[in-house]
């Protein structure tokens, strides 16, 4: 009869009837006394109802802690648990009393009209219809309608308990509008009250807070948090908020159902928390919990409250960013601030605007970084409220992997005359400069492009047995000069030269440059020939529309069948500067050319004349001669470059200047063009004539006027002319001071 916390020597209130269950007849008197060791009280069935007037609880005639419960003329509805408990504790003694009333075996509910049972359509859930019995051992079935169905206890999931009611899986009665319990006593049927069946949902799909994160405010601003719960149909939602400052006067909570589209299988509920003027104590975690009774889902967000608007850079803000050409560079503006600042980026003081190559926002993104992106970038943060500004400079250093200048030219596959001294060059541009440039070599025959050997795009030479130039055993005697540094096209470049003291053996030479971000290499074909010799007449690079002759000279006693060819398109795609040698082995790529044969006492000379040379005539020209005895073919290759015709241009301006009498003036006028232009000087539109005071040097590029006189004042013009036209620049020279009088009067 005792319930409570099981513990050592626990003293519970003592009941006068020492039983767990008491069965009494209707219309008799129920009296139970409860004695204890501290203040106690009684609880009885339906003790919230009006029937309470019938129940009398009195103090015993002895004892500090003793109370007697009396109910005269009990009825079936008095059936239930009678509990005597110690106040302010969970310690109690219970007796279950059955008041047997065969005319009403079911205990009526408080309303006596009908009850409501709420169920969820869940296979695993059971529902209890609270038709309690005033008799413990009744045969009870459950009737559901409409359509009418009867459920009988099966000893498993369907059962009836007089203290609890009828238990059945929810889904079995979810179709029904109402249910009731029925008991048979001596062939008589007795029904409990009707229970209306209400199918309720319980599933909460999600609970979303808006804003969901990163909520920042400053003191005095309004906080509005929306909590939206999405549920299945037939769900009621109870919202519960937890937040830091519960004693908030300006807090407002509004809950409402949101309209969903008709036919939607979902309901939406919204709870809005508003705090009109936040204080620092409102900073913290805000949690919204939505509960449907069977399910609770919650979501949280952190609200940060600042004393006042501010802006500052975060500790992770970089000052130096290193990148390699071609990479994507991201420089995030890491800041702390409220509200979020306006962000502006500058490069070397000039504002940056976003375009397809650069995005200037919270993150400065350079899509494909190039050398010209190197520099100082300033990011300025401006607080939109206080207008406070903070700036930070980030230096961007762009590294360039080694690039070898000669690789960009069409590779000279010229042959080199046996026994001559030759210089091979690699001009390297890299940032940072290469920490080393190494030279390697291998014999040409080890690397010959035999038809049986596959040549790939990435590896045009089938061999990879490169040897260090220090080991020139079996090759040409080599000397590597100390690297030189030169300013070429405005860039600091490293020039490495390899001197072949005597061209005795055909070989391949490779220069390899390495810096911290990469490597670059160039392979040079060094084909040595004892055969014919090619010369150009005139001995210079021709310009478009000029005429040029290629002479192939061979010893008549050794060679015969001199023929000129032009090297045609490659049968295989091969890297620029990586043409396989020797060309004699692959005549399919050669185009035969018309030429004129001349002879002198010892040599045959085959001349191929190009009149009005065009850019299309550029390329590699091959002279082939056959050994009279062995019939072996010997090839010599010469690369012909035709310079484009370019109209004259003058680089740099002549500037107006003021000079005092007796001083000197020195000016220069640099012109470029092809053919090279002639430079002429004019004073006041008349040709300037050299005399003792006027000196023209370096092809008239430099003009010097010594000991200027007043009459030297005027408009000076530099004019550069060629067949393609003229270019000119002008400047006015002002001569100050009085002319000294001579004593010739």
């Amino acid at each position: 009869a005792s319930v409570g916390l099981p513990s050592v020597s626990l003293d519970l209130p003592r009941l006068s009837i020492q039983k767990d269950i008491l069965t009494i007849k209707a219309n008799t008197t129920l009296q139970i006394t409860c004695r204890g060791q501290r203040d106690l009280d009684w609880l009885w069935p339906n003790n919230q109802s009006g029937s309470e007037q019938r129940v009398e609880v009195t103090e015993c005639s002895d004892g500090l802690f003793c109370k007697t419960l009396t109910i005269p003329k009990v009825i079936g509805n008095d059936t239930g648990a009678y509990k005597c408990f110690y106040r302010e504790t969970d310690l109690a003694s219970v007796i279950y009393v059955y008041v047997q009333d065969y005319r009403s075996p079911f205990i009526a509910s408080v309303s006596d009209q009908h009850g409501v049972v709420y169920i969820t359509e869940n296979k695993n859930k059971t529902v209890v219809i609270p038709c309690l019995g005033s008799i413990s051992n009744l045969n009870v079935s459950l009737c559901a309608r409409y359509p009418e169905k009867r459920f009988v206890p099966d000893g498993n999931r369907i059962s009836w308990d007089s203290k609890k009611g009828f238990t059945i899986p929810s889904y079995m009665i979810s179709y029904a509008g109402m249910v009731f319990c029925e008991a048979k006593i001596n062939d008589e049927s007795y029904q409990s009250i009707m229970y209306i069946v209400v199918v309720v949902g319980y599933r909460i799909y999600d609970v979303v807070l808006s804003p969901s994160h990163g909520i920042e405010l400053s003191v005095g601003e309004k906080l509005v948090l929306n909590c939206t719960a999405r549920t299945e149909l037939n769900v009621g939602i109870d919202f519960n908020w937890e937040y830091p400052s519960s004693k908030h006067q300006h807090k407002k909570l509004v809950n409402r159902d949101l309209k969903t589209q008709s036919g939607s299988e979902m309901k939406k509920f919204l709870s809005t928390l508003t705090i009109d003027g936040v204080t620092r104590s409102d900073q913290g975690l805000y949690t919204c919990a939505a509960s449907s009774g069977l399910m609770t889902k919650k979501n949280s967000t952190f609200v940060r409250v600042h004393e006042k608007p501010f802006v500052a850079f975060g500790s992770g803000m970089e000052s130096l960013v290193e990148a390699t050409v071609g990479e994507r560079v991201r420089i995030p503006a890491k800041y702390l601030g409220y509200p979020p600042p306006e962000i502006k980026w500058y490069k070397n003081g000039i504002p940056l605007e976003s375009n397809h190559t650069i995005k200037a926002g919270h993150v400065l993104t350079i899509m494909e970084v190039s050398e010209r992106d190197t520099g100082n970038y300033t990011v300025i943060l401006t607080n939109p409220i206080s207008k406070e500004k903070q700036s930070h400079v980030v230096s961007l250093v762009v590294y360039v992997p080694p690039q070898i200048g000669e690789k960009s030219l069409i590779s000279p596959v010229d042959s080199y005359q046996y026994g001559t001294t030759q210089t091979l060059t690699c001009t390297v541009y890299a940032i940072p400069p290469p920490h080393h440039i190494h030279w390697y070599w291998q014999l040409e025959e080890e690397c010959a492009n035999e038809p049986s050997q596959a040549v790939s795009v990435t590896n045009p030479y089938p061999c990879e047995e490169w040897r260090s130039v220090e080991d020139f055993q079996g090759g040409n005697k080599i000397e590597v000069n100390k690297n030189q540094f030169a300013l070429i096209e405005g860039k600091n470049k490293t020039v490495s030269t390899l001197v072949i003291q005597a061209a005795n053996v055909s070989a391949l030479y490779k220069c390899e440059a390495v810096n911290k971000v990469g490597r670059g290499e160039r392979v040079i074909s060094f084909h040595v020939t004892r055969g014919p010799e090619i010369t150009l007449q005139p001995d210079m690079q021709p310009t478009e529309q000029e005429s040029v002759s290629l002479w192939c000279t061979a010893d008549r006693s050794t060679f015969e069948n001199l023929t000129w060819y032009k090297l045609g398109p490659q049968p295989l795609p091969i890297h620029v500067g990586e043409l396989p040698t020797p060309v004699c082995k692959n005549l399919d790529t050669l185009w035969k050319l018309n030429a004129t044969m001349f002879s002198n006492s010892t040599n045959d000379i085959l001349i191929m004349e190009l009149k009005n040379a065009s850019l299309q005539d550029q390329g590699d020209y091959v002279c082939l001669a056959q050994d009279r005895k062995t019939k072996k073919r010997h090839c010599v290759v010469r690369q012909l470059t035709v310079l484009e015709r370019v109209a004259p241009t003058i680089t740099g301006n002549l500037e107006n200047q003021t000079t005092s009498i007796g001083e000197s003036i020195e000016v220069s006028c640099t012109a470029s063009g092809n053919p090279p232009p002639q430079i002429m000087w004019f004073k006041d539109n008349e040709t300037l004539v050299e005399d003792s005071g006027i000196v023209l040097k370096d092809g008239n590029r430099n003009l010097t006027i010594r000991r200027v006189r007043k009459e030297d004042e005027g408009l000076y013009t530099c004019q550069a002319c060629s067949v393609l036209g003229c270019a000119k620049v002008e400047a006015f020279f002002i001569i100050e001071g009085a002319q000294e009088k001579t004593n010739l009067e």
Epitope: S9, Q37, G63
Partner: antibody, heavy 114, light 110 residues
Framework: EVQLLESGGGLVQPGGSLRLSCAAS????????LSWVRQAPGKGLEWVSA????????YYADSVKGRFTLSRDNSKNTLFLQMNSLRAEDTAVYYC???????WGQGTLVTVSS | QSVLTQPPSASGTPGQRVTISCSGS????????VNWYQQLPGTAPKLLIY???QRPSGVPDRFSGSKSGTSASLAISGLQSEDEADYYC???????????FGTGTKVTVL
């Protein structure tokens, strides 16, 4: 918050009388049994008297039986201890408390001396 | 004259466990429940344990009570300086028809 506030203590001559009161608040007064406990200076606790919630049952220590009377006015949430024929050995701090011991007042000093 | 007997004093160093006994008879501890009280110097007693072993809310779980036959005991585990006080046991006595208190034990934290 439960509060028990004793009053009525003071100096009295041997053979004299005093009426102590205990005003209660913060709980349903008539539901609880109450008692008086005293503590002589430098001594231990001694139970004096107790009364049931309705006032129907009262109990006294042998040392005060016949001299002290305990009563309560549930309408005024007040407990009374009428002390007659006071003796020097009745000198003590008198505490009003729930009989369960859950709550105690701060006590009132009774001094019996000539 | 007290009917329940307690040792006059008990002591321990901080963190130690101290146990106080309370010895009675069949008419009090033997047939009724025991309460334990703590009295700090100059203050009213405070309930520490009721119904032999139940702790009111707010009382640290370092305090525990037990009863066996006609004796009861209070244990303080992990003794702290603020535990320095007088401790009393109490029970209803069926023969005397009233409450009886123990002689009291003074606990000192060394």
């Amino acid at each position: 918050e439960v509060q028990l506030l004793e009053s009525g203590g003071g100096l009295v001559q041997p053979g004299g009388s005093l009426r102590l009161s205990c005003a209660a608040s913060g709980f349903t007064f008539s539901n609880y049994a109450l008692s008086w406990v005293r503590q002589a200076p430098g001594k231990g606790l001694e139970w004096v008297s107790a009364i049931s919630g309705s006032g129907r049952n009262t109990y006294y220590a042998d040392s005060v039986k016949g001299r002290f009377t305990l009563s309560r006015d549930n309408s005024k949430n007040t407990l009374f201890l009428q002390m007659n024929s006071l003796r020097a050995e009745d000198t003590a701090v008198y505490y009003c408390a729930k009989a369960s011991g859950d709550n105690w007042g701060q006590g009132t000093l009774v001094t019996v001396s000539s | 004259q007290s009917v329940l007997t307690q040792p006059p004093s008990a002591s321990g160093t901080p963190g130690q466990r101290v146990t106080i006994s309370c010895s009675g008879s069949s008419s009090n501890i033997g047939s009724n429940t025991v309460n334990w009280y703590q009295q700090l110097p100059g203050t009213a007693p405070k309930l520490l344990i009721y119904l032999n072993n139940q702790r009111p809310s707010g009382v640290p779980d370092r305090f525990s009570g037990s009863k066996s036959g006609t004796s009861a005991s209070l244990a303080i585990s992990g003794l702290q300086s603020e535990d320095e006080a007088d401790y009393y046991c109490s029970a209803w006595d069926d023969s005397l028809n009233g409450y009886v208190f123990g002689t009291g034990t003074k606990v000192t934290v060394l």
